[in-house]
């Protein structure tokens, strides 16, 4: 392994995100060599850092069903991180999924 | 056919408690967040709580917190509510909803409370 | 603690248009939705994430939301649009919300 832990998120933000700024997110799972599992919000202004989040907490499943019904412009990205550089925190990544849907809108 | 069916609302005294459940049918249980909302006699909604999918997370509204405790059981798919120290201003009928992003996309048909001595 | 204002009433003539007002600090930076409910009935979503229509809803009903108010509005009003509706929203703490109400008469 080339560093395991360091591409990973290791703790989730106090913060929370308000779900008009988000456009998309993508999974952190322990099975792919993360510590934790982690969720990791996407802001629309690429200059700001993705929020890392706790999968079992209410906010947080709300904000990804609604990501998951909502319909976006772009084709989904292929893999992690592909569309953007290594972000300043040097974290590559690794061990995650990318849930930018753009099929399938789950509305009512 | 997706349903929810509120059930254990009746007459309580003042400082009592009542526990109602909601059975929930014909959608993935744990695969939705769910709410009580509550409807006092000619009034309006009122949000009560909600809970995330596998019951880690909840919120309340602050009329109720200390008193109300959501629960669900997966299992059973079964939603709960405990209501304790019950007060005349919680009359009203209960209703159970889901809950998908931010809105309620299914309602039960609510079930009655009424605290009265 | 947030809240959401409503207008008590609105009336509108048979076949013309209705716009239902909820009003709530920066509402606008989160999703609202809107419910129907008819006397004896529990309520029926009619609008969510600010102007989606569910499947089954009349294209007569849409929505809108910025700044400090959500917008109901119902074109072609008819009789059976009579009803009691609320308005309601998230915050970031998934904490929820609902509007006192508003009664639609429709005239004629």
């Known amino acids: 392994s080339d560093g395991g832990a360091q591409d990973c998120c290791l703790k989730y933000s106090q913060r929370k995100i308000p779900a008009k700024v988000v456009r998309s997110y993508r999974k952190q799972e322990p099975s792919l060599g993360c510590s934790i599992p982690a969720i990791l919000f996407l802001p629309r202004k690429r200059s700001q850092a993705e929020l890392c989040a706790d999968p079992k907490e209410l906010w947080v499943q709300q904000l990804m069903q609604h990501l998951d019904k909502t319909p976006t412009p772009r084709k989904p990205v292929q893999g992690c991180r592909k569309d953007r550089g290594v972000p300043k925190n040097g974290k590559k990544g690794k061990g995650c999924k990318r849930t930018e849907q753009s099929q399938t809108p789950k509305g009512p | 056919e997706v349903q929810l069916l509120e059930s254990g609302g009746g007459l309580v005294q003042p400082g009592g408690s009542l526990r109602l459940s909601c059975a929930a049918s014909g959608f993935t249980f744990n695969s939705y967040s769910m709410s009580w909302v509550r409807q006092a006699p000619g009034k309006g909604l009122e949000w009560v709580s909600a809970?995330?999918?596998?019951?880690?997370?909840?919120s309340y509204a602050d009329s109720v917190k200390g008193r109300f405790t959501i629960s669900r059981d997966n299992s059973k798919n079964t939603l709960y509510l405990q209501m304790n120290s019950l007060r005349a201003e919680d009359t009203a009928v209960y209703y159970c909803?889901?809950?998908?992003?931010?809105?309620?996309?299914?309602w039960g048909q609510g079930t009655l409370v009424t605290v009265s001595s | 603690s947030y809240e959401l204002t409503q207008p008590l009433s609105v009336s509108v003539a048979l076949g013309q248009t209705a716009r239902i007002t909820c009003g709530g600090d920066?509402?606008?930076?989160?999703?609202a939705s809107w419910y129907q409910q008819k006397p004896g009935q529990a309520p029926v979503l009619v609008i969510y994430d600010d102007n989606e229509r569910p499947s089954g809803i009349p294209e007569r009903f849409s929505g809108s939301n910025s700044g400090n108010t959500a917008t109901l509005t119902i074109s072609r009003a008819q009789a059976g649009d009579e009803a009691d509706y609320y308005c309601?929203?998230?915050?970031?703490?998934?904490?929820?919300?609902f509007g006192g109400g508003t009664k639609l008469t429709v005239l004629g």
């Open positions: 309601s929203s998230w915050d970031m703490d998934a904490v929820n919300v």
């Open positions: 920066s509402i606008g930076s989160q999703y």
């Open positions: 909803a889901r809950g998908y992003g931010y809105y309620f996309d299914v």
């Open positions: 809970i995330s999918m596998e019951g880690y997370s909840k």
